[in-house]
């Protein structure tokens, strides 16, 4: 997601399952850090935002024609799992060690 | 990149290699369609934007706290190669059938 004038980076985002209505099936944890990708994808794109060729092209076009095309976007490029205690189909508390794709591991410009 | 009020989708983006300064080494084509991912990632995220769990969580948090976190971003999730005729290190015109990651194949919310 787009942010202020800082460059694309991973920042903390505490998520409470009750706030998003997932407390009806996730028993624990009550909250977790999902992290968020925040900041701009400015020219020149640094190696740490692991830009694709398309992101580089789009950044160059944006530089030349800012109104024609937007900048590349700072998004999660690698996600991590979390462990959850959830209610299975029968409502029984069940442990999933690796609930995939729930937390940002790395951000990049895409 | 974020767009108007339409939902996340692939749109045409004609790129002229001269405009981005790549004509110095790319002989042909003179231009190509890089495509662009444009539009918003609105709740509820449709299947066609192949949202990750993190994108779904972020969308739900944005819904509850719009000022705390941005929406997920519409970005390329799959890229395609193009064929180029380029000058190699010695300036010899060389054909590369698959110059990877140059064109958007699919967009999604991340």
């Amino acid at each position: 997601s787009t942010g202020a004038s800082s460059h694309c980076q991973k920042t903390s985002l505490r998520v409470n399952f009750e706030d998003i209505g997932w407390d009806s099936w996730i028993i624990a944890p009550k909250e977790y850090d999902a992290y968020e990708c925040k900041g701009g994808c400015f020219f020149p794109l640094a190696d740490d935002v692991t830009p694709t060729k398309h992101a580089i092209v789009q950044t160059l076009v944006h530089l030349k024609f800012p109104t024609k095309v937007g900048k590349a976007c700072c998004v999660p490029t690698k996600l991590s799992p979390i462990s959850i205690l959830y209610k299975d189909d029968m409502g029984v508390p069940t442990l999933k060690y690796h609930y995939e794709g729930m937390s940002v591991a790395e951000c990049g410009c895409r | 990149s974020t767009g108007a009020s339409s939902h996340c989708q692939k749109t045409s983006l004609r790129v002229n290699f001269e405009d981005i300064g790549w004509d110095s080494w790319i002989i042909a084509p003179k231009e190509y369609d890089a495509y662009e991912c444009k539009g918003g990632c609105f709740f509820p995220l449709a299947d066609d934007v192949t949202p990750t769990k993190h994108a779904i969580v972020q969308t739900l948090v944005h819904l509850k706290f719009p000022t705390k976190v941005g929406k997920a971003c519409c970005v390329p999730t799959k890229l395609s190669p193009i064929s180029i005729l380029y000058k190699d290190d010695m300036g010899v015109p060389t054909l590369k059938y698959h110059y990877e990651g140059m064109s958007v194949a699919e967009c999604g919310c991340r």
Epitope: D88, M90, G91, P93, L95 | -
Partner: antibody, heavy 126, light 111 residues
């Protein structure tokens, strides 16, 4: 082979509390829940509650809510059941039993209580 | 009173077949798996049948479980003296969010 070994018999006065322990050996403690089931003399089995040590999350039968506390110590692979405000009707054999909680195990088996501890007799008498 | 209903006692002669019934409701047996436990005199319960009709290793194939609607039953064929025990059915109750047991059935092997 997972084994559950419980603490010894207890004699308690009405109004007091009792804390029974259940030590697990073999297997991974964080892979399972420990449940407590009691059996009054000549009576059937009655589920009291259980705990998932990985998160320290406990849940209880309505009947015992507020009077029972189930805890677990992952470092020693031991679960505890504390029952307060004891009355004579609480005289029973208290069993701990394991239930696998990891969803990597087939649901049919995941919901079974297996194995059980040997039981702890708690006598409440003035 | 137990949530799941079992007959207090059943009996049979050695070699015979006996069945123990367990009746519940849509929120327990009707929508969840049924488990059977055997409790020999003076010992802790032991898992006998899991997931309606599965036997853990070491349990003889003389024991079998079945489920239909909101009822379940345990069948024991070729009855032996060592089968004399209390038998309990058990299921998760989705509505009450608790594990429920039957009142138990005492099996007596005659003769």
């Amino acid at each position: 082979q997972v084994q559950l070994v419980q603490s010894g018999a207890e004699v308690k006065k009405p109004g007091s509390s009792v804390k029974v322990s259940c030590k697990a050996s073999g297997g991974t403690f964080s892979d399972y829940a420990i449940h407590w089931v009691r059996q009054a003399p000549g009576q059937g089995l009655e589920w009291m509650g259980g705990i998932i040590p990985f998160f320290g999350t406990a849940y209880y039968a309505q009947k015992f809510q507020g009077r029972v506390t189930i805890t677990a110590d992952e470092s020693t692979s031991t679960a505890y059941m504390e029952l307060s405000s004891l009355r004579s009707e609480d005289t029973a054999v208290y069993y701990c039993a394991r239930r696998i909680v990891s969803d990597s195990v087939a649901v049919q088996y995941r919901h079974a209580f297996d194995p059980w501890g040997q039981g702890t007799l708690v006598t409440v008498s003035s | 009173q137990s949530v799941l209903t079992q007959p207090p006692s059943v009996s049979g002669a050695p070699g015979q077949r006996v069945t123990i019934s367990c009746s519940g409701s849509s929120s327990n047996i009707g929508s969840n798996y049924v488990y059977w436990y055997q409790q020999l005199p003076g010992t802790a319960p032991k898992l006998l049948i899991y997931g309606n009709n599965n036997r853990p290793s070491g349990v003889p194939d003389r024991f079998s479980g079945s489920k239909s609607g909101t009822s379940a039953s345990l069948a024991i064929t070729g009855l032996q003296a060592e089968d004399e025990a209390d038998y309990y059915c058990n299921a998760w109750d989705t509505k009450a969010y608790v594990w429920v047991f039957g009142g138990g059935t005492k099996l007596t092997v005659l003769g």
